[in-house]
Interface confidence: medium
């Protein structure tokens, strides 16, 4: 199946790259506006300039365009622990991120929350904390991994998955007790 082109894509495809077809006169190709600007008025005729105006404060366009309005700058979500990495400029949206020793957990495509990287206490760092992934820990002997924290095998109940990891430890304890009674 051939995907249908949208009206705007159809119109643009008639003109060479960097130009768009005049909405009222399809024989005219107008030059697109540079990033950081928006379309105020279409070019009056072939070879004549498109009237582009710079985006106002709080708005931007990040690529060449023929938008009638600039896009509103994103705001970092404080309730998600986000911090501003770089401010919005006329040609670039706000860049949001996390503080040092934190990683992003994406709840949806454009929505992330910042969480502290695990420290791997009672274990070692197997994989360092990344921008979008928590530290991966490996636990020392006598400890097992539960919710990415190293927990003592003394907290391991028979019904839990940790019994496999703590089995040598449990057998050692039993063995010591048995040898003490004979």
């Amino acid at each position: 199946l051939v995907p249908h082109l949208g009206d705007r894509e159809k119109r643009d495809s008639v003109c060479p790259q960097g130009k768009y077809i005049h909405p009222q006169n399809n024989s005219i190709c107008c030059t697109k506006c540079h990033k950081g600007t928006y379309l105020y008025n279409d070019c009056p005729g072939p070879g004549q300039d498109t009237d582009c105006r710079e985006c106002e404060s709080g708005s931007f366009t990040a690529s060449e365009n023929h938008l009638r309005h600039c896009l509103s700058c994103s705001k970092c979500r404080k309730e998600m622990g986000q911090v501003e990495i770089s401010s919005c400029t006329v040609d670039r949206d706000t860049v949001c991120g996390c503080r040092k020793n934190q990683y992003r957990h994406y709840w949806s495509e454009n929505l992330f929350q910042c969480f502290n990287c695990s420290l791997c206490l009672n274990g070692t760092v197997h994989l360092s904390c990344q921008e979008k992934q928590n530290t991966v820990c490996t636990c020392h002997a006598g400890f097992f991994l539960r919710e990415n924290e190293c927990v003592s095998c003394s907290n391991c109940k028979k019904s839990l998955e940790c019994t496999k990891l703590c089995l040598p430890q449990i057998e050692n304890v039993k063995g010591t007790e048995d040898s003490g009674t004979t």
Epitope: H105, Y106, W107, S108, E109, Q113, F115, E147, N148
Partner: nanobody, 120 residues
């Protein structure tokens, strides 16, 4: 077929409690983040709470922080929302939502909703 079935809504007095449940089927529950969204009468959708696939990470809207607790039981394919100290402004239809499939990172499936009415 993905199905999300909410239950536990009802009429409750201010200061009271309710526990919502969401029974999930038709997908591998343990692999997905889940969330609760609500829509008050005449208002837009509001994210209430979200929980990661393993239950470790949670998000709460400021309006419910300290009063609501999200949890999940992956062995039962069920999502929960414990709502305490309920207020009149918590009156809404509460929806259970499943997160994205693959690269289409959006909450792609919603339940039918359960109505919570807080009134004296």
């Amino acid at each position: 077929e993905v199905q999300l079935l909410e239950s536990g809504g009802g009429l409750v007095q201010p200061g009271g409690s309710l526990r919502l449940s969401c029974a999930a089927s038709g997908f591998t529950f343990i692999e997905y983040d889940m969330g609760w969204v609500r829509q008050a009468p005449g208002k837009g959708l509001e994210w209430v709470s979200m929980i990661s696939s393993d239950g470790r990470l949670t998000y709460y809207a400021d309006s419910v922080k300290g009063r609501f607790t999200i949890s999940r039981d992956n062995s039962k394919n069920t999502l929960y929302l414990q709502m305490n100290s309920l207020r009149a402004e918590d009156t809404a239809v509460y929806y259970c939502a499943k997160t994205w499939d693959g690269l289409n990172r959006n909450f792609d499936y919603w339940g039918q909703g359960t109505l919570v009415t807080v009134s004296s």
